[in-house]
């Protein structure tokens, strides 16, 4: 039975040209995290494998940095980066947990962070 929950940074906004940290946290389970995949609309951004470390997709090498922790830092943001991002936690023995973050990249200098929310 999957008892864990994923807490994410929720709906967030950032300025064009700036950076943003995507963060997820798995709680309420003792399952072992074997791998975390980061996706943007079905496209792989990065993998953090517990044994083998990080892989940043070649398509994003120049704009994506690993961390902090199991999170991901997006740099040199453009309006095209607006959209859904997913953290996919592969765990043993529970299985797969998925968290969703919506990022809006704003042209203006006013960019406020949204509230946190949980996905069971």
């Amino acid at each position: 039975m999957m008892t864990g929950t994923i807490e994410t940074t929720g709906n967030i906004s950032a300025e064009k040209g700036g950076s943003i940290i995507l963060q997820c946290h798995l709680s309420s389970t003792t399952a072992q995290v074997t791998q975390v995949n980061w996706e943007q609309q079905d496209q792989l951004l990065a993998i953090c494998n517990a044994d083998l470390g990080w892989h940043i997709s070649p398509s994003f090498k120049d704009r994506v940095a690993p961390g902090p922790g199991l999170g991901l830092t997006l740099q040199s943001l453009t309006v095209n980066d607006t959209g859904e991002y997913f953290c996919i936690y592969h765990t043993y023995p529970d299985g797969t947990y998925t968290g969703r973050i919506f990022l809006e990249v704003l042209e203006s200098s006013v960019a406020e962070h949204g509230a946190r929310f949980q996905i069971p």
């Epitope: 995949n37 496209q43 494998n49 990080w54 940043i56 070649p58 398509s59 940095a65 690993p66």
Partner: antibody
Framework: EVQLVQSGAEVKKPGSSVKVSCKAS????????IGWVRQAPGQGLEWIGD????????NYNEKFKDRVTITADKSTSTAYMEFSSLRSEDTAVYYC???????????????WGQGTLVTVSS | DIVMTQSPDSLAVSLGERATINCKSS????????????LAWYQQKPGQSPKLLIY???TRESGVPDRFSGSGSGTDFTLTISSLQAEDVAVYYC?????????FGGGTKVEIK
């Protein structure tokens, strides 16, 4: 011992399709990329595409994108490459490879299958 | 696409002598975050599958003799066989794995003079 064992040689008619398999053993299948590379007779190496089974993420060479589908079956640790609308110039040896593209090890295509000769002829 | 240009196309070297193969990429293969160049070298003997020799420009794969060495950074790379042996007769390919699509050089055929 890491091994990649490919299916046998194929002879195909122009316009048809071929599906080549690659069975992996000796490592955790879902942790590494499986790539496909071809080599026409007497020619060099050409990357077709790859798949990461731990998420089924695929990447294709634009040159082949409309004609190639790469899949993986984690239950049998087997990857497949299906090539459609075959032409005589697709006659080649097709290799599967294991790819290590982690930023801390980065060993590229560290293991290769024995190759599968696909002959396209009318 | 990154274009990989190898030279020479073929090379005849006496046993025990040095063989040098060059590889040039059309853009830098250096990844700033780990300061590694995503460049590999493969050896393909007649009738065999290619075999990984060197990755990250200069790291020898396990079991590869130390007469094989790689060097370079950015866009210019070299594979050196310090003392050619009969079993080194093969075609050698460089390959970039920095960006998609991964691309290979055209190959260099090494023969005994």
């Amino acid at each position: 011992e890491v091994q990649l064992v490919q299916s046998g040689a194929e002879v195909k008619k122009p316009g048809s399709s071929v599906k080549v398999s690659c069975k992996a053993s000796g490592y955790t299948f879902s942790n590494y990329w499986i790539g496909w590379v071809r080599q026409a007779p007497g020619q060099g190496l050409e990357w077709i595409g790859d798949i990461y089974p731990g998420g089924a993420y695929t990447n294709y060479n634009e040159k082949f994108k409309d004609r190639v589908t790469i899949t993986a079956d984690k239950s049998t640790s087997t990857a497949y490459m299906e090539f459609s609308s075959l032409r005589s110039e697709d006659t080649a040896v097709y290799y599967c490879t294991r790819g290590d593209y982690y930023d801390s090890s980065g060993r590229a295509m560290d293991y290769w299958g024995q190759g599968t000769l696909v002959t396209v002829s009318s | 696409d990154i274009v990989m240009t190898q030279s020479p196309d073929s090379l005849a070297v006496s046993l025990g002598e040095r063989a040098t193969i060059n590889c040039k990429s059309s853009q830098s293969l250096l990844y700033s975050r780990n300061q590694m160049n995503y460049l590999a070298w493969y050896q393909q003997k007649p009738g065999q599958s290619p075999k990984l020799l060197i990755y990250w420009t200069s790291t020898r794969e396990s079991g590869v003799p130390d007469r094989f060495s790689g060097s370079g950074s950015g866009t210019d790379f070299t594979l050196t066989i310090s003392s050619l042996q009969a079993e080194d007769v093969a075609v050698y390919y460089c390959q970039q794995y920095y960006s998609y699509p991964y691309t290979f050089g055209g190959g260099t055929k090494v023969e005994i003079k």
